[in-house]
């Protein structure tokens, strides 16, 4: 969702639903800033490139972040 003039947060709604790491094209973690006071997690799915905002407080999403960072650390030398 595009940004309003004063606030630059992106997500209108956030999802608690588990996401299969294999179905992810990209995972963006946008830290809090002067423009948006909280972290935003935006998942881009492989299928159709559909984006979804994820709930950083959800247990399922926390597990997803762990799985993704584990995968990344495996790949990096």
């Amino acid at each position: 969702i595009p940004l309003s003039r004063t606030v630059r947060c992106t997500c209108i709604s956030i999802s608690n639903q588990p996401v299969n790491p294999r179905s992810l094209e990209k995972l963006e973690i946008i830290p809090p800033s002067q423009f948006c006071p909280h972290v935003e997690i935006i998942a881009t799915m492989k299928k159709k490139g559909e984006k979804r905002c994820l709930n950083p407080e959800s247990k399922a999403i926390k597990n997803l972040l762990k799985a993704v960072s584990k995968e990344r650390s495996k790949r990096s030398p």
Epitope: C9, C11, S13, N16, E50
Partner: antibody, heavy 120, light 108 residues
Framework: QVQLVDSGGGVVQPGRSLRLSCAAS????????MHWVRQAPGKGLEWVAV????????HYADSVKGRFTITRDNSKNMVHLQMNSLRAEDTAVYYC?????????????WGQGTLVTVSS | EIVLTQSPATLSLSPGERATLSCRAS??????VAWYQQKPGQAPRLLIY???NRATGIPARFSGSGSGTDFTLTISSLEPEDFAIYYC??????????FGQGTKVEIK
């Protein structure tokens, strides 16, 4: 099950104010954006306003910008629409609707609507 | 602002017949179109999203198709409860989110 109950409508004179409310239940309210959509008598649907799950993002239709304010109270599962400087053309049934929780907006559940009549 | 034009304005059909409703966008909206059904005195109900996905609890006789600027809602065999007004809506990623003017499906 998901339920949205709209209230606060009535007959009001031009230039006056009215506050609509929407009580939500049956879902995790504080993760969903909420919208107001209106329908003038015998006419089609017009999107009015949206508020994000945390109340930070707010957008308005040009026709109501500067006159209407959307707010929410996540502790009470409520959304409100404060309507000021009302005009005859604001006469409509006002529906509160839940955001689809997808990147691209659609409305997956709707309230029953509350009628606002602006007339002198 | 994206304008949606629905046709025809009214469709007069008998139960059991096939209904084909059209929605045309003033510019490409990819596959981001939703369809709603509204009966007199009731709130709209989501039928189809992303052009072709049926919402929860919607019967298989309702189907959607199309992409870009041209979209179609098809009711394969009209049931008595399907006579209503149908609206399309574009799901762009920026407001305002607009609706078509509606197509009324009435009993012939």
């Amino acid at each position: 099950q998901v339920q949205l109950v709209d209230s606060g409508g009535g007959v009001v004179q031009p230039g006056r104010s009215l506050r609509l409310s929407c009580a939500a239940s049956g879902f995790t309210f504080n993760t969903y954006g909420m919208h107001w959509v209106r329908q003038a008598p015998g006419k089609g649907l017009e999107w009015v306003a949206v508020i994000s799950y945390d109340g930070i993002i707010k957008h308005y239709a040009d026709s109501v910008k500067g006159r209407f304010t959307i707010t929410r109270d996540n502790s009470k599962n409520m959304v409100h629409l404060q309507m000021n400087s009302l005009r005859a053309e604001d006469t409509a049934v006002y529906y509160c609707a839940r955001d689809s929780s997808s990147w691209y907006v659609y409305f997956d559940y709707w309230g029953q609507g509350t009628l606002v009549t602006v007339s002198s | 602002e994206i304008v949606l034009t629905q046709s025809p304005a009214t469709l007069s059909l008998s139960p059991g017949e096939r209904a084909t409703l059209s929605c045309r966008a003033s510019q490409s909206v990819s596959s981001y179109v939703a369809w709603y059904q509204q009966k007199p005195g009731q709130a709209p109900r989501l039928l189809i999203y992303d052009a072709s996905n049926r919402a929860t609890g919607i019967p298989a006789r309702f189907s959607g198709s199309g992409s870009g600027t041209d979209f179609t809602l098809t009711i394969s065999s009209l049931e008595p409860e399907d006579f209503a007004i149908y609206y399309c809506q574009q799901r762009s990623n920026s407001p305002p989110w607009t609706f078509g003017q509606g197509t009324k499906v009435e009993i012939k």
